[in-house]
């Protein structure tokens, strides 16, 4: 029959962080392989990974054509060596993915700080806006071009000397805090999508940036910037 | 200093599709900001339509979203309202208005801080 | 949605009085989302007041907000003869943003 032996794929599990989505199942293969196939819900069946060894599958380019759709995805299990054949009408074993909304579902993933300064009481903290892999016009979209206001950064800092933290909450990527003088001041923030009601509304915070642990930290406006 | 207009069939017929274009001036429309539409039924209060970013990231009124459609030209500093299957209940003075970042508590929020002079809609056969 | 009801519906005072306009919402509303807008007859609304007590630019400051929460007060010290209009308050914090019914002002 073409298909004797084979064990249809089980655990299938989106895997999707800043809208790079990728498929993962289960078990690893024994003399078989793998296709996947995926779709929206009034689209056409379109495979991928075509008789992969592997136990994942990259869907990206995919699901970046248009993230708030919903999508479906499986799995087809093919004996090890298998090539297409035209005779075969036997379909092979396969199992269904989740259904899958990449805007409501993605993880937020871990933002940056991309620089900060002090004029005075005043220090301006800039997170770092991410690209993503969805694009509109040939153009690759950041983070903030496909949440829009969706998105909110929360800012926590603290005094070097204590650890009492403070939070400011901001629609873009910017904030502009007050700060007292003389201090040095920590940082890190966290991404927000308020509107999600699931465990992926939030990132994991920044890494912490802190004034004045930093070469290229200038001592007149305490600025600080990273490269990436 | 930005300023908005905007323009479109000031009549429709029931069960056609209205459709509206605001023209930014004075300002890029890919400038950090917010585009909106808002409507006032006759003698009546505010009702948000929805928005939409530079990108092409939208957000709509629940109330309305299997109806409506904003979109974003760049290349002619305007974005648009598309209603379909419009009834007598979609007659009513039409704006748009810019959502611009405003200073706030240590962050930045956004506030329809301009706004076209409208344009009345009048759904009738 | 969250439903804000403005009182009263109207109010009718002279040239030089204190206005009091209140703004409640159906649920909880973070200030940083608060608006409050002037709106006069034939004219598009001006915005006067963000984040819920901010006056934005070119706002007099006879025009003051204040609340948070779910109560929400926009206060005209001493009313001029140009300040007879309509007032909205709206939030922008949750789809879909919606606004209050309004409230007119108008000569006594």
């Known amino acids: 029959s073409g298909t004797t032996n084979t064990v249809a794929a089980y655990n299938l599990t989106w895997k999707s962080t800043n809208f790079k989505t990728i498929l993962e199942w289960e078990p690893k293969p024994i003399n078989q392989v793998y296709t996947v196939q995926i779709s929206t819900k009034s689209g056409d069946w379109k495979s991928k990974c075509f008789y992969t060894a592997d136990t994942e599958c990259d869907l990206t380019d995919e699901i970046v054509k248009d993230v708030k759709q919903t999508y479906l995805a499986r799995v087809f299990s093919y004996p090890a060596g298998h090539v297409e054949s035209t005779g075969s009408t036997e379909e092979p074993p396969y199992e269904n993915s989740p259904e899958f909304t990449p805007y409501l579902e993605t993880n937020l993933g871990q933002p940056t700080i991309q620089s900060f300064e002090q004029v005075g009481t005043k220090v301006n903290v800039t997170v770092q806006d991410e690209w993503t892999l969805v694009r509109r016009n040939d153009t690759f979209l950041s983070l903030r071009d496909v949440f829009g206001k969706d998105l909110i950064y929360t800012l926590y800092y603290w005094k070097s000397s204590s650890s009492g933290k403070k939070t400011a909450k901001t629609n873009t990527n910017e904030f502009l805090i007050d700060v007292d003088k003389g201090e040095n001041y920590c940082f890190s923030v966290q991404a927000v999508i308020p509107s999600r009601r699931t465990a992926n509304r939030k990132s994991t915070d920044s890494p912490v940036e802190c004034m004045g642990h930093e070469k290229g930290e200038s001592r007149e406006t305490g600025h600080h910037h990273h490269h990436h | 200093q930005v300023q908005l207009q905007e323009s479109g069939p000031g009549l429709v017929k029931p069960s056609q599709t209205l459709s509206l274009t605001c023209t930014v001036s004075?300002?890029?429309?890919?400038?950090?900001?917010?585009w909106s539409w808002i409507r006032q039924h006759p003698g009546k209060g505010l009702e948000w339509i929805g928005e939409i970013y530079y990108s092409g990231s939208t957000r709509y009124n629940p109330s309305l979203k299997s109806r409506v459609t904003i979109s974003v030209d760049t290349s002619k500093n305007q974005f648009s309202l598309k209603l379909s299957s419009v009834t007598a209940a979609d007659t009513a003075v039409y704006y748009c208005?810019?959502?611009?970042?405003?200073?706030?508590?240590?962050?930045?929020?956004?506030?329809?801080?301009?706004w076209g002079k409208g344009t009345t809609v009048t759904v009738s056969s | 949605e969250i439903v804000l009801t403005q009182s009263p519906g109207t109010l009718s005072l002279s040239p030089g009085e204190r206005a009091t306009l209140s703004c409640r919402a159906s649920e909880s509303v973070d200030s940083s989302y608060l608006a409050w807008y002037q709106q006069k007859p034939g004219q598009a609304p001006r915005l006067l007041i963000y984040?819920?007590?901010s006056r934005a630019t070119g706002i007099p400051d006879r025009f003051s907000g204040s609340g948070s929460g779910t109560d929400f007060t926009l206060t005209i010290s001493r009313l001029e003869p140009e300040d007879f209009a309509v007032y909205y308050c709206q939030q922008d914090g949750v789809v879909p943003y919606t606004f209050g019914g309004g409230t007119k002002v108008e000569i006594k």
């Open positions: 004075g300002g890029s429309i890919s400038s950090g900001q917010y």
């Open positions: 208005a810019r959502d611009a970042p405003y200073y706030y508590g240590g962050g930045y929020y956004y506030y329809m801080d301009v």
């Open positions: 984040g819920a007590d």
